[in-house]
Interface confidence: low
């Protein structure tokens, strides 16, 4: 039988009455245009909603926007458009919400053609009040907050100036001209690229990379011949043009650009690209595009310095620079990532890794599913997940895969079961163990969200017709109840719940359409009365993550340690609550060869855990570039995987000798770098 129709599915008692008492409708006094929603702070209940409506006039387009505020998680909204002087807000800049619980908000206004600069509205009290500020420049990008100090803002102007404010947008100073890209680093550092000969596009590959650590008082040039740069975890990356040709290479720094090392990655040509897929303080997943318009490349994983890379996955689907990749970090279980590969027959298949890119495998076929027409053998196939690429191809996939750090082990995604991703209408699948096993959860495409740290899953069917029904599950998607939240169906546009999945409120957004008008409407449903009591100790059970063989002493060991979690029993209908903290008990594992990656010049043959020397490097001295010096590497081929905590057991020896010679790198060596002050 279909999910949710089994005999053992118990119904949640009196849920209709409980939900009816906690369903709040708000009709917005707006013609339907576009709507954007932002949460201000964490656990504050404050939501800002900006609606915009364009009226095309004969010669120009007249815009009108309204701003609404809720402080009860969306149950009630107040029109606060007068706080921003009824000004039209530019939606392309969105609402710039400050980091953490700063309560800061910046809205960028539309200004008339002849004005000297732009205009912003600033709030530092969770949008209770706004201050209008006229800018000395026209912004090109949204205001960017420093992660360390929300009073510090940076923005680029339409004239390519880099502007900084130290008092939350009250006063602005242009600290540099001819800037292409600027980013905040750690400790209020700003990194930016500059051009010399006319424009960012014309100088691509000849840009300079600059750094300021004092908000523009002084600068240091930390790189030349730059194509682009990026920050990931504690790593600063720059792609740098080679001296002789049009290829470029990745250089990496872990000291904010003072010293650089050449990453042991293939160089790329003009039509190719590098992309940082994921990065943390331990390591980086890097995609290197294949030559030609293939739509795929190779994933490499780095060592702890971001210098030595191991090939992780071939034929990784990534269409173009800034294009689509299905690479997804499964945040509900450590070490798990999902992505797609383009196989030799040009079909697209989903792969999963449970050990941070060490090994990739197909997803196990859900037990309650049949293989589809993509399968050569009707009894042997895999689950294939729809993500960004499928969405970009306008397939019937309303949402990307979903996981939440505090809903341990839960992954929800659209998928198909066969030998490859199918163009057919997908179903929704759920994993409760971080991707090891899967079950069909819902028939057909749905929108879905996780509430109360996994205590409730909510879903709405994806339909072109108006809807008035919401589905919810209190047992991780095994059984489903349906609730009619309104008599009058609405054209559904989105589900909104507070980021972090701790809330018990869900907002259903849509519009009503009558003969003469259409209006935005939201229904906010509070599930607090469905989960009547707080969860107690008896409601939780011990779960060993990554467990595949309970007989094995090392069962659950991933990256050198195993973790036991306290997880809510599926049968318990209770509140984890807003203050719920994931309880986990780690224990260290003995080291095995699986805890080491292959060092520079070594690789792992398929289905072998030993690292062997690359044939072309056999008998050669292994020399590589480190911090602008040439190093001589004496190694037996292993280096500990970044973040691996294993102890004892196997311990391959490794030694690096400094050759005390300069690298032949076209990148600036530290001595050549220059500084200047304003």
């Amino acid at each position: 039988s279909a999910p949710g129709e089994d005999e053992e599915c118990g119904r949640v008692r009196d849920f209709v009455a409980k939900l009816a008492n906690n369903t709040h409708q708000h009709v917005f006094d707006d013609l339907r245009g576009s709507v954007s929603l932002s949460w201000v702070g964490d656990s504050t209940g404050v939501i800002l909603v900006l609606t915009t409506f364009h009226v095309p006039l004969v010669i120009m387009t007249f815009g009108q926007s309204k701003l609404y505020r809720s402080e009860d998680y969306g149950k009630n909204f107040k029109d606060i458009t007068d706080l921003i002087n009824n000004t039209f807000i530019r939606t392309e800049f969105g609402m710039a919400i400050g980091p953490e619980n700063s309560g800061k908000v910046v809205l960028t206004a539309e200004v008339s053609g002849g004005s000297r600069g732009g205009r912003i509205f600033r709030s530092s009290d969770f949008a209770k009040n706004f201050v209008q500020t006229d800018l000395p420049f026209h912004p090109l990008t949204q205001m960017m907050y420093s992660p360390q100090n929300s009073d510090y803002l940076l923005a680029l102007s339409t004239e390519n100036g880099l502007w900084v404010s130290k008092n939350f947008g009250g006063k602005w100073e242009e600290i540099h001209k001819a800037v292409c890209l600027a980013k905040w680093g750690s400790d209020n550092t700003i990194f930016f690229t500059t051009y010399a000969n006319g424009s960012c596009k014309a100088d691509l590959g000849a840009l300079e990379l600059w750094r300021t650590s004092d908000l523009g008082k002084s600068f240091k040039t930390i790189g030349v011949k730059i194509y682009s740069f990026g920050l990931g975890g504690r790593f600063l990356f720059a792609s740098v043009m080679a001296d002789k040709d049009t290829t470029r290479r990745i250089h990496v720094s872990t000291d904010q650009g003072d010293t650089w090392s050449m990453a042991q990655l293939p160089s790329v040509g003009q039509e190719q690209f590098y992309s940082i897929l994921a990065a943390n303080d331990d390591m980086v997943f890097m995609h290197v595009d294949e030559p030609g318009d293939t739509g795929f490349g190779t994933i490499f994983t780095s060592d702890d310095r971001g210098i030595v890379y191991s090939k992780s996955l071939d034929r990784h689907l990534y269409t173009t620079t800034g294009g689509e990749t299905d690479f997804t970090n499964v945040t509900s279980l450590r070490g798990v990532y999902i992505t797609s590969v383009l196989s030799e027959d040009n079909s697209i298949q989903t792969m999963i890794t449970f050990d941070q890119g060490g090994r990739w495998t197909h997803l196990r076929k859900p037990e309650n599913s049949e293989c589809d027409a993509t399968a050569k053998n009707k009894n042997e196939c895999s689950l294939h997940i729809h993500a960004s690429y499928s969405i970009s191809q306008k397939l019937n996939v309303p949402m990307a895969p979903l996981s939440e750090p505090n809903a341990v082990g839960i992954v929800i995604a659209h998928g198909s079961v066969g030998d490859a991703i199918s163009v057919m209408v997908p179903d929704v699948y759920i994993s409760d163990d971080g991707g090891y096993s899967w079950t069909k959860m819902l028939e057909g495409p749905h929108y879905y969200t996780i509430l109360d740290s996994g205590g409730i899953i909510v879903a709405i069917e994806h339909s072109s017709r108006p809807i008035n029904v919401i589905k919810f599950s209190t047992d991780e998607g095994q059984c489903w109840q349906t609730y009619t939240f309104t008599r009058d169906p609405i054209y559904f546009t989105g589900l909104a719940s507070e980021p972090g999945a701790r809330s018990m409120n869900i907002s259903i957004w849509g519009f009503t359409e009558s003969f003469l008008t259409s209006q935005w409407v939201s229904y906010t449903i509070d599930f607090k009365d469905i989960l009547e009591r707080n969860c107690e100790e008896k409601d939780y059970t011990i779960w060993l993550a990554h467990s595949t063989d309970p007989e094995d002493y090392e069962d659950g060991c991933i990256l050198g340690y195993k973790e036991q979690f306290l997880r809510l029993r599926k049968s318990s209908v209770c509140q984890n609550g807003r203050d719920y903290v994931v309880t986990k008990q780690p224990s260290i594992c003995l080291c095995s060869l699986e805890d080491f990656l292959c060092d520079f010049g070594y690789y792992r043959p398929e289905n072998d855990s030993k690292c062997v020397e690359q044939p072309e490097l056999k008998g050669h001295d292994l020399e590589f570039c480190l911090y602008g010096r040439e190093e001589h590497l004496t190694t037996n081929g292993y280096r500990k995987i970044p973040g691996d905590k294993c102890q004892g057991g196997v311990n391959p020896v490794r030694e690096v000798k400094d050759l005390k010679k300069k690298c032949t790198s076209n990148f600036l060596s530290p001595e050549k770098q220059n500084s200047k002050s304003n």
């Epitope: 318009d293 293939t294 739509g295 795929f296 689907l317 269409t319 294009g323 689509e324 383009l342 027959d345 040009n346 079909s347 697209i348 049949e370 293989c371 589809d372 027409a373 993509t374 399968a375 050569k376 009707k378 690429y389 499928s390 191809q393 306008k394 397939l395 030998d419 490859a420 991703i421 199918s422 163009v423 057919m424 209408v425």
Partner: antibody, heavy 129, light 107 residues
Framework: QVQLVQSGAEVKKPGASVKVSCKAS????????MSWVRQAPGQGLEWMGI????????SYAQKFQGRVTMTRDTSTSTVYMELSSLRSEDTAVYYC??????????????????????WGQGTTVTVSS | EIVMTQSPATLSVSPGERATLSCRAS??????LAWYQQKPGQAPRLLIY???TRATGIPARFSGSGSGTEFTLTISSLQSEDFAVYYC?????????FGGGTKVEIK
Amino acid sequence: QVQLVQSGAEVKKPGASVKVSCKASGYTFTKYYMSWVRQAPGQGLEWMGIINPIGGSTSYAQKFQGRVTMTRDTSTSTVYMELSSLRSEDTAVYYCARDPSGIALAGPASRSYYGMDVWGQGTTVTVSS
Amino acid sequence: EIVMTQSPATLSVSPGERATLSCRASQSVSSNLAWYQQKPGQAPRLLIYGASTRATGIPARFSGSGSGTEFTLTISSLQSEDFAVYYCQQARLGPWTFGGGTKVEIK
């Protein structure tokens, strides 16, 4: 040999429904998707939708959404296309066509499209009061 | 949806001559394109798939080229049995769409 044999011509009144069948032979029915394409008199070809013969899941062109239903019977290797609420502009020849492209989602750039390689002989549906 | 435009609508060619048919897509369809031939009272027949690969049993005088948005079907030396209507079709994005057709007639 591989062939698709469709049901005979139909004459229907406006508002009625028509159900056209397409029987496959000479290949493994569950290995290929089936597309339906129609052609109004003197007009070009128009794709209606596609069906997956194993799961029976479908994907329809927006224009026919809500009016068309594609089903299959694996025991007889037959695919059906039902069009409801018929109007005079639905008068056309309806073709089923084997569509290997359904075997995988269109990949980027390098993916090859295999085309609808086997067609039924067509079924003429006339809608007239 | 992707709109496919064929030109010319009608092409008058003498037997033995070369015929060049064009097909343009409103956005890139990469190489996910097929060409079909249809004669009066018959079902369409697949000629070319993947923009340039001849289907089984199709004579070498038929060739396809192009990628992205511009495609061409070339018949190097027209035979009497080649006078028909030719359609291009994309399968890059659903729904699959056909061009309006080019009728190749005897001059």
